[in-house]
Amino acid sequence: GPVWRKHYITYRINNYTPDMNREDVDYAIRKAFQVWSNVTPLKFSKINTGMADILVVFARGAHGDFHAFDGKGGILAHAFGPGSGIGGDAHFDEDEFWTTHSGGTNLFLTAVHEIGHSLGLGHSSDPKAVMFPTYKYVDINTFRLSADDIRGIQSLYGDPKENQRLPNPDNSEPALCDPNLSFDAVTTVGNKIFFFKDRFFWLKVSERPKTSVNLISSLWPTLPSGIEAAYEIEARNQVFLFKDDKYWLISNLRPEPNYPKSIHSFGFPNFVKKIDAAVFNPRFYRTYFFVDNQYWRYDERRQMMDPGYPKLITKNFQGIGPKIDAVFYSKNKYYYFFQGSNQFEYDFLLQRITKTLKSNSWFGC
């Protein structure tokens, strides 16, 4: 079955049951997510606006899916497996009486079960498991997942252990204003631009002339040197970093545990052994992966490759290619492509190069 292909997952409480105080609902849902984050590498973050991965809804009767609720008793709630749109969403029947205790239906216990489904778990045949299909009140102060629940969720996401530290080769710092300077990877991170080269990265804060050089290992000790591609999904505070056939996920500037993972989990064919460059376009919610003289397009919402790819870079990005070293997205309409010591500002709306620059032009050289 499906799983979330990321470890940083957002949720939003769409509306609140009148049966409980809002703070108690928030607390019950937060604690329910925590039950699962305690035993996996997953991290859950509540957002109040925008599109969350998991939408928590209180509704009665027909409520926009095929599975209308049935009044008091019977079906208490249901949740959809990981995916885009309705995927992951958890619906609670408003005709139940939701509580913080043993009276009525305990929201925390029901939410733990439903979030299990939201994360990809099916029902368990173990009566002690929270994923057993029938509701039974247990003391929430001493509540624990059963061994079967833990086994199930860790088979999908692994355990919460950190990765082992990876060594870095010893490269000397490149000269920033060398006219022949090229970069391995470039990406935005919020209002900053990270330029990767060997075991170093330069940090450029938008509109400020000052830049600083850093060792990759000083910021992210578990990451290797020689990052080959990078992209950011700013709305999720995520940065993906690639080297060889592996990738790492950085959430809120912290490496997620249980990485690296194989690039083939994105859906690349086996002959793809490394990514040259990658860029996410928030307008289309697509990531473009550049490999040799071709590129793939990946739908970040549906978490699958778009059909019809790969395509030739030269055919669809006029004046760019046949291969590129790095690329990043900026100012809502430009890709900046890096090829050796040259850089091309490319307007993706007009579909043409609007400026040719040196790769290190961002540093006032």
């Epitope: 079955g1 499906p2 769409n14 599109m51 939408l55 809804v57 509704a59 027909a62 409520h63 926009g64 899916d65 095929f66 599975h67 249901h78 949740a79 959809f80 497996g81 995916g83 885009s84 749109g85 309705i86 995927g87 969403d89 489904h117 099916g122 919402r301």
Partner: antibody, heavy 122, light 103 residues
Framework: EVQLLESGGGLVQPGGSLRLSCAAS????????MHWVRQAPGKGLEWVSG????????MYADSVKGRFTISRDNSKNTLYLQMNSLRAEDTAVYYC???????????????WGRGTLVTVSS | DIQMTQSPSSLSASVGDRVTITCRAS??????LNWYQQKPGKAPKLLIY???SLQSGVPSRFSGSGSGTDFTLTISSLQPEDFATYYC?????FGQGTKLEIK
């Protein structure tokens, strides 16, 4: 490439029966919810029926409940619609459509077949 | 049961025009709304899912918005191939369709 190919349509008299099939390829059929949607000549789309990946859960529009039966054979990658007690108002092009993976249906029809025409007339 | 009301039922426009079609649910369906395009003699094609997410391979001139009960499908600059019938849908309920014709 995902492909859905309906067959079994044709002309049938009121009160008669017909069985439609939908052969699926290009995806793991047993992971997905599947549905039938119909369209009467010159009219809009009408959802008819849906079935869960295992076949354990089925759903029907009120207009066909008790007359139509949806089923699937995951070993053959095939979806079926058994239509009994057919009426003139069942005349339509019948499409099979793929939904999402998982325990519940989203009603998100991302791939459709080309349709098969069922005509109920005396 | 939830009802879906789509408007207008037909619409004439020219190539290059910006066109908006609306769909209203009789009660909240959150963002659980999809839009389809259908051309004569063809199967419907998914354009937008979850109210605003563009389906793979669909041109970016198509966009969707809304949540709760009110939703819109917008085509920013009509192309000749966009003249078709458009349907909104949630679960087992389709809107009655909007036929988009050349002016």
């Amino acid at each position: 490439e995902v492909q859905l190919l309906e067959s079994g349509g044709g002309l049938v008299q009121p009160g008669g029966s017909l069985r439609l099939s939908c052969a699926a390829s290009g995806f793991t059929f047993s992971d997905y919810w599947m549905h039938w949607v119909r369209q009467a000549p010159g009219k809009g789309l009408e959802w008819v029926s849906g079935i869960s990946p295992s076949g354990g859960m089925t759903m029907y529009a009120d207009s066909v409940k008790g007359r139509f039966t949806i089923s699937r054979d995951n070993s053959k990658n095939t979806l079926y619609l058994q239509m009994n007690s057919l009426r003139a108002e069942d005349t339509a092009v019948y499409y099979c459509a793929r939904d999402i993976v998982g325990p519940y249906s989203a009603g998100l029809f991302d791939y459709w077949g080309r349709g098969t025409l069922v005509t109920v007339s005396s | 049961d939830i009802q879906m009301t789509q408007s207008p039922s037909s619409l004439s426009a020219s190539v290059g025009d910006r066109v908006t079609i609306t769909c209203r649910a009789s009660q909240s369906i959150y963002t659980y709304l999809n839009w389809y395009q259908q051309k004569p003699g063809k199967a419907p094609k998914l354009l937008i899912y979850a109210a605003s997410s563009l389906q793979s391979g669909v041109p970016s001139r198509f966009s969707g918005s809304g949540s709760g009960t009110d939703f819109t499908l917008t085509i920013s600059s009509l192309q000749p191939e966009d003249f078709a019938t458009y349907y909104c849908q949630q679960a087992g309920i389709f809107g009655q369709g909007t036929k988009l014709e050349i002016k």
